[in-house]
């Protein structure tokens, strides 16, 4: 399968427009709003967990959210929603967000795992490097509020709402 | 590989009620919505409803309301279809279908033929 | 509910015959178009989906095409296993529907 999105009138909340495939964009239709971490399967006639497809070759319409998915269930790595990206937090300690605190007090305390650069900043040398500096302070983190990717915990996220068209 | 296997043939009374089943292997069953499509002999197919063995979630076709539920048993990776009060327009084969969520049903049961008969 | 319409219900053709089977849309369905094949007491099985794409293991001389409300199935050279029974179904909108059929008969 080749991932066509199904979401072009779908309607997540706060869906990635640009996640779409070009013949996603679907304008016939009126959009259905799902609650966030869903997604709306029109033929299905209702709203699904995007967890149910994050391991199939579908899961453009979910492409977001499965990728914090993924990236949540790797150590020492947190998705920014902001960039979309699954940031390692080994290349940002130091100036790290709280999903990374973990991470980063734990590398601190032993030097030796550090990178050199992170090495030096620990003993006082301060690399300037201006593109950087900064970068992570100011975003909204909302990856610290998902939760584990754990069936049947969180039920508002995981049950399919029954949307009756 | 995919494969769906239907329970087999049954031959039941006005009035009665059947239960096919429809067991899966080679993917992760629980994630997959499976749909059921009922063939009257010698005509097309028609969509009766799906059901989403992740959460048990159902959707029935409104002519199939009241007549069909659809349920799963995620321990044998299995659904099941049962239509209640039967009549001679419930003979067909009742096909188990997987969905694809492109809008397709890309594996199917090998289809139970039902047949009602005084 | 979304009408299918496929013509012609049924058609003769002998083996090398390029054949043509169309499917028309009550209403815009997009390229959310899925062809079947059915073959006598067997389960149908998907051949194509959204409008051309050949489901695996699908031979090359099916095609499709189309878009909106009118698609095509073409088999361009007929072999002895295409005789059948052809469905579309369109794969857009709640509740998923399907095409009356066209069969495919040896002349």
């Known amino acids: 399968m080749s991932g066509l999105g199904r979401s072009r009138r779908g309607g997540r909340s706060r869906v990635d427009q640009e996640e779409r495939f070009p013949q996603g964009l679907w304008t016939g239709v009126a959009m259905r709003s799902c609650p966030e971490e869903q997604y709306w399967d029109p033929l299905l006639g209702t709203c699904m967990s995007c967890k149910t497809i994050c391991n199939h070759q579908s899961q453009r319409t979910c492409a977001a959210f499965c990728r914090s998915l993924s990236c949540r269930k790797e150590q020492g790595k947190f998705y920014d929603h902001l960039l979309r990206d699954c940031i390692s937090c080994a290349s940002i300690c130091g100036q790290h967000p709280k999903q990374c605190a973990y991470f980063c007090e734990n590398k601190l305390r032993s030097p030796v795992n550090l990178p050199p650069e992170l090495r030096r900043q620990r003993s006082g040398e301060v690399e300037n490097n201006s593109d950087n500096s900064g970068r992570y302070q100011g975003l909204e983190h909302r990856g610290s509020e998902a939760s584990p990717a754990l069936p049947g915990l969180k039920l508002s996220a995981d049950q399919v709402a029954l949307v009756y068209s | 590989q995919v494969q769906l296997v239907q329970s087999g043939a049954e031959v039941k009374k006005p009035g009665a009620s059947v239960k096919v089943s429809c067991k899966a292997s080679?993917?992760?069953?629980?994630?997959?919505?499976m749909h059921w499509v009922k063939q009257k002999p010698g005509q097309g197919l028609e969509w009766m409803g799906w059901?989403?063995?992740?959460?048990?979630?159902?959707k029935y076709a409104q002519k199939f309301q009241g007549k069909v539920t659809m349920t799963s048993d995620k321990s044998t990776s299995t659904v099941y279809m049962e239509l209640s009060s039967l009549t001679s327009e419930d003979t067909a084969v009742y096909y188990c279908?997987?969905?694809?969520?492109?809008?397709?049903?890309?594996?199917w049961g090998q289809g139970t033929l039902v047949t009602v008969s005084s | 509910d979304i009408q299918m319409t496929q013509s012609p219900s049924s058609l003769s053709a002998s083996v090398g015959d390029r054949v043509t089977i169309t499917c028309r849309a009550s209403?815009?369905?997009?390229?959310?178009l899925n062809w079947y094949q059915q073959k006598p007491g067997k389960a149908p099985k998907l051949l194509m989906r959204?409008?051309?794409l050949l489901h695996s293991g699908v031979p090359s001389r099916f095609s499709g095409s189309g878009s909106g409300t009118d698609f095509t199935l073409t088999i361009s050279s007929l072999e002895q296993e295409d005789f059948a029974t052809y469905y579309c179904?369109?794969?857009?909108?709640?509740?998923?529907?399907f095409g009356g059929g066209t069969k495919v008969e040896i002349k």
């Open positions: 179904q369109q794969g857009n909108t709640f509740p998923p529907t």
């Open positions: 279908a997987r969905y694809d969520y492109e809008g397709s049903f890309d594996y």
């Open positions: 959204y409008t051309s």
């Open positions: 209403q815009d369905i997009s390229n959310y």
């Open positions: 080679g993917y992760t069953f629980r994630n997959y919505v």
């Open positions: 059901i989403l063995p992740y959460n048990d979630g159902t």
